[in-house]
Every structure is written in C-alpha cells, then in structure tokens.
Interface confidence: medium
C-alpha cells in the first residue's frame, strides 16, 4: 500500500481549525493478524529524507497521538490528553487518516507528517509516510478560511476547505 496526501499545502488564518489528511491507497490487508499503527508528528524538510526527524505537535509526541487497531477497524485517539491540546487524530474504514488542530496559532506553521505502519506481528512490517505543509497567517493578507492546495498528482486548482 501507499500513503497519499490529498493536499500538500494548507494556508489558514490564525484562530481557525484545520484537518490535515492522509489516505491509504492500494491493497490493504484486513486479516486478523494484521494491525495498523498510525500517527502524526512535525518534521523539517531534510536534505536526505523528508519526515526523518520526529518533533512533537503542540508538545504531544507521535506516541501520544498514535492510533493502533486491527485492519478492519476505525479508531480515534484517547481524547483527554490530545483534546486538552486542541488535537484529535482519527481513522475511518475507508483508509482516511487525519489530525484536527483547533484554534491555530502562528507557532503551528510547519511541515506535518503522517506515518502508517502495517504490522504482521513477528512476520513483517511496512512503513510509509506522507508530508504536508501548514502555513498559519495573520493580518490583512490572511485568508478568511483555510485554503488547501492539492498535491501535484491531483488537480492543481485551489480548493477552499468547508
């Protein structure tokens, strides 16, 4: 399987909420012995490999934000810790995997990475990640709502998030 990032850039005004999204593509094994570990973290555009550096999102590490579930299940992060920081990660039955960040500030700007690990315990593991940029703007040049820019593999028109 692969991870697709429908949008490579999110431009949002300060104070807005945004949902960053990754999507699993290709055949996904949903057998009993397969589990998925999904998480989010901040990173920087490394010269060698994007997403190789793992930094916290609002002081929450990738361990704090992780989802771990069987191949056929949906999942949400444990609400307490994440929601206190205005964060929630979720995964649905259709391969969509997201993190919602509430009340954005300029400090939230940066590169965000999703990581998915397909695990057949003691047999194999397959790791894939996706990256996207979040720009939080303030002042007269800031958009009134979040504007998302599709990844290059998709239609290049701007799409305004609902």
């Amino acid at each position: 399987f692969k991870v697709a990032t429908p949008y490579s850039l999110y431009v949002c005004p300060e104070g807005q909420n945004v949902t960053l999204t990754c999507r699993l593509l290709g055949p996904v094994d949903k057998g009993h012995d397969v589990t998925f570990y999904k998480t989010w973290y901040r990173s920087s555009r490394g010269e060698v490999q994007t997403c190789s550096e793992r930094r916290p999102i609002r002081n929450l590490t990738f361990q704090d934000l992780h989802l771990h579930h069987g191949g056929h299940q949906a999942a949400n992060t444990s609400h307490d810790l994440a929601q206190r920081h205005g964060l929630e990660s979720a995964s649905d039955h259709h391969g969509n995997f997201s993190i919602t960040m509430r009340n954005l500030t300029l400090l939230d700007s940066g590169l965000y990475c999703c990581l998915v690990v397909e695990i057949r315990h003691h047999h194999s593991e397959h790791r894939v990640h996706g990256a996207m940029e979040l720009q939080v703007q303030t002042g007269k040049d800031a958009p009134s709502n979040c504007v998302v820019y599709p990844s290059s593999s998709q239609d290049s028109e701007n799409i305004t998030a609902a």
């Epitope: 589990t35 570990y37 990738f62 771990h68 444990s78 315990h121 003691h122 047999h123 194999s124 593991e125």
Partner: antibody, heavy 116, light 111 residues
Framework: EVQLVESGGGLVQPGGSLRLSCAAS????????MGWVRQAPGKGLEWVGI???????YYASWAKGRFTISRDNSKNTLYLQMNSLRAEDTAVYYC??????????WGQGTLVTVSS | DIQMTQSPSTLSASVGDRVTITCQAS???????LAWYQQKPGKAPKLLIY???TLASGVPSRFSGSGSGTEFTLTISSLQPDDFATYYC????????????FGGGTKVEIK
C-alpha cells in the same frame, strides 16, 4: 521434539568477542521470529534483539553496533555475535521463539561471563 | 527509551491468597502485544498469558490477565505452593522501531 538449545557461552575477557548459537529442532527456524533475551545474575529479563520472519532484524538500543543477530536456515540455527564485551554483559542468554504475539518457546540458556 | 514498570517488586503472600501484580508501560501497548511470564530459579521463563488476557496452553485458570493502554494486571485468584516464583510482563512496541520491553519482575515469596 520441539526445542531450542543454546551453546557457545563461557568466560571471555573485557573487549573480547563471543558467538552464541541456538539450535532449533522440531520446527523450521525460518518460519518463526527468533529473539535473544538475557538475564544478569540476580536481575530481571532484558531483551537483546529479534529477527522476524521477513528477515528484518531489530535490536535494543544498547545492543546496536556491538551485537549482531543472524540465522542459518540450512542449519536451522540462530546466532548472536557479541563484540566489545563488557563486564555488564555477564548474563545468561536465552533464545526464544516468537509464537503468535509472544515468546512461547525458550531455550535453557547459556551463561556468558565477562571478566579479566 | 520505553519502560515497563512492575509493582510491587516483591510480594509476600500465603497459600490461598489472592495476588495482583501490575505492569505500567511508558507508552500505550496494543493489548495483543502484552504477555506475562513466570520464572523459577535456574529455569527459563514460561509463558503464562498472551494478548493481555489469554491463558497459554496448560496454565491453570487461577491465573488471569486484564488491562489495556498503559495499565495491565496479572491476578492469581488463589495462590498455590507451585506459584512462588518471579513474574514478568512483556510488551512489544513498533514505534519508533520494534522493541520488546520487559518489566523489572515481581518476586512472589512465602509470607
């Protein structure tokens, strides 16, 4: 009979090397994850590393660079190569088979003593 | 590093007592990947419980396991003479890399 038998332990000087073997019988080593776990005298269990079915090998952070796990499927044997040994590596070393989600089959262990 | 913390480290009990041992992980463990072992002096560990609550083959029903997330428990409902031993929890983690972590052990001794 399904069993694991470790060998290769003994006395070695600090800075020295040792290779432990774990001979499997009654099953095919290549079909299972195989791990090494050690236990210092009077202490608890400490994970060393594992080779999973796909061939990926993982180590405890302290073992990276000094310890190497390998397997020889034709001999049905698992190995642990230990280099730059220190006094704190003194322990009984167990090999263990990954059964489903856990270690279900263990060897009897082999004692490694690092001392001058 | 990931830590598995067991408590108590030593437990004095009598035959017939109900005994509870707890294991706390420094990060969430998928319950399928949590196991308990029993070890007697000079012997290799023996698997008691896997997937947090499933009894291994041949293990008496007085042993039970429970818990999820970061908190797990091993309970012996009525301690028997053969149960005086050291018990270890073990969890597997895949992030950031594969790690098997063992708890420090709980020695159950005769009161």
């Amino acid at each position: 009979e399904v069993q694991l038998v470790e060998s290769g332990g003994g006395l070695v000087q600090p800075g020295g090397s040792l290779r432990l073997s774990c001979a499997a019988s009654g099953f095919s080593l290549s079909s299972y994850a195989m791990g090494w776990v050690r236990q210092a005298p009077g202490k608890g269990l400490e994970w060393v590393g594992i080779i999973i079915v796909s061939g990926n090998i993982y180590y405890a952070s302290w073992a990276k660079g000094r310890f190497t796990i390998s397997r020889d499927n034709s001999k049905n044997t698992l190995y642990l190569q230990m280099n730059s040994l220190r006094a704190e590596d003194t322990a009984v070393y167990y090999c263990a088979r990954g059964d489903g989600y856990t270690y279900g089959l263990w060897g009897q262990g082999t004692l490694v003593t690092v001392s001058s | 590093d990931i830590q598995m913390t067991q408590s108590p480290s030593t437990l004095s009990a009598s035959v017939g007592d109900r005994v509870t041992i707890t294991c706390q992980a420094s990060q969430s463990v998928y319950s399928r990947y949590l196991a308990w072992y029993q070890q007697k002096p000079g012997k290799a560990p023996k698997l008691l419980i896997y997937s947090a609550s499933t009894l291994a083959s041949g293990v008496p029903s007085r042993f039970s396991g429970s818990g999820s997330g970061t908190e797990f428990t091993l309970t012996i409902s009525s301690l028997q003479p053969d149960d005086f031993a050291t018990y270890y929890c073990q969890g597997t983690f895949y992030i950031p890399d594969y790690i098997d972590g063992f708890g420090g052990g709980t020695k159950v001794e005769i009161k």
